[in-house]
């Protein structure tokens, strides 16, 4: 593991990353749950959507989210004009025309209705911390991840590589 400076190093170029092409390389419909198997659910309340983290009853159907995967070129650290590698960015849409957005000022995760092209706040860098878990890092705020706080989704700052594996930023994707 590479310590705090390493986290800053691998996130600093996110601002400069460019999404290659406007269409996703693939799309994947999945239910989203926390590391502790609580479900992420979406409810329409007063013409806006609320996001909840909750235990579902035994036969209760899980909400699905459409994950759209985009390739993003990552500039080379050395020269600035080369490409060091590729990242996967995702957008998450639980219902037509609504996407998860990072509200960095409020440290919150919100559902916004918007048209394409989507704003940068709707894009999240996809991380695998474990073989069966993913994390979502804000494109607009490197080092900040979607996480669980008080039974809601929130934005959580991760300031060291040890904290990258903290359970509250780990999520499971399931087709069932």
């Amino acid at each position: 593991a590479f310590g705090i400076s390493g986290v800053q190093k691998y996130t600093r170029a996110l601002h400069d990353s460019s999404i290659t092409g406007i269409s996703p390389i693939t799309e994947y419909l999945a239910s989203l749950s926390t590391y502790n198997d609580q479900s992420i659910t979406f409810a329409l309340e007063d013409e806006s959507y609320e996001i909840y983290v909750e235990d579902l009853k035994k036969d209760e159907k899980k909400d699905k989210v459409l994950l759209s995967y985009y390739e993003s070129q990552h500039p080379s650290n050395e020269s600035g004009d080369g490409v060091d590698g590729k990242m996967l960015m995702v957008t998450l849409s639980p219902t037509k025309d609504f996407w998860l957005h990072a509200n960095n000022k409020e440290h919150s995760v919100e559902l916004h209705k918007c048209e394409k092209p989507l704003p940068d706040q709707a894009f999240f860098v996809l991380h695998n911390m474990h073989s069966n878990c993913v994390s979502f890092e804000c494109k607009t705020d490197p080092g900040v991840f979607i996480g669980v706080k008080d039974n809601h989704l929130a934005l959580i700052k991760v300031d060291s590589s040890e904290n990258l594996c903290t359970e509250n930023i780990l999520f499971k994707l399931s087709e069932t």
Partner: antibody
């Protein structure tokens, strides 16, 4: 240019140990999951071990679990495979591979080393 | 574990032929499927990832398709340098698994 260079292969007796190394260059090593894949003579490809980009997680198939250990040294941009209690069926060319994307396992293995041959025989 | 069954295990074809290789998974998964080409004494080379994405530098005569449990690699017009062994690989669930390979030989 991305380069992966394996070393450490050779002839070893059953029950013996061997440590393979993979020297990586041409990319930001600590941003990638790394994986060992092997190929027995005249056979197909078999996944051997994977390690997360942080080094915090390691994964193995049942065939090597408890005998093989994958590790990484980001300061040296190096990947390792410690192989203990070797068996005749571990005889294979061992390849070091790199994931396609930063931080992620998705998208196959675009970069492979030249491979190093491990022969387990008495 | 997800078993990947490739067919045929070998085939003979001529330059210019259209060649199709299939990979059948024992259970459905997201489209994290890759295809590799390997020539004798060489390391495998990634051709296709995400079931249908062409890896940089790979000729456009190679294409991939499929989802769920059925995946296909197609070579639209076989070239002399395409005679090799081809492997599929799923990356969706651990343990990662490869197909048994398809050897494409000259007729």
């Amino acid at each position: 240019e991305v380069q992966l260079v394996e070393s450490g292969g050779g002839l070893v007796q059953p029950g013996g140990s061997l440590r393979l190394s993979c020297a990586a260059s041409g990319f930001t090593f600590n941003n990638y999951w790394m994986t060992w894949v092997r190929q027995a003579p005249g056979k197909g490809l078999e996944w051997v071990a994977s390690i997360t980009y942080t080094g915090g997680g390691t994964y193995y198939p049942d065939s090597v679990k408890g005998r093989f250990t994958i590790s990484r040294d980001d300061a040296k941009s190096s990947l390792y495979l410690q192989m203990n209690s070797l068996r005749a069926e571990d005889t294979a060319v061992y390849y070091c591979t790199r994931a396609n994307y930063y931080y992620n396992t998705y998208g196959g293995f675009p970069y492979w080393g030249q491979g190093t041959l491990v022969t387990v025989s008495s | 574990d997800i078993q990947m069954t490739q067919s045929p295990s070998s085939l003979s074809a001529s330059v210019g032929d259209r060649v199709t290789i299939t990979c059948l998974a024992s259970e459905g998964f997201s489209n994290d499927l890759a295809w590799y080409q390997q020539k004798p004494g060489k390391s495998p080379k990634l051709l296709i990832y995400a079931a249908s994405r062409l890896q940089d530098g790979v000729p456009s005569r190679f294409s991939g398709s499929g989802s769920g449990t059925d995946f296909t690699l197609t070579i639209s017009s076989l070239q002399p340098e395409d005679f090799a062994t081809y492997f599929c690989q799923q990356g969706s669930k651990y343990p990662l698994t490869f197909g048994g390979g398809t050897k494409v030989e000259i007729k």
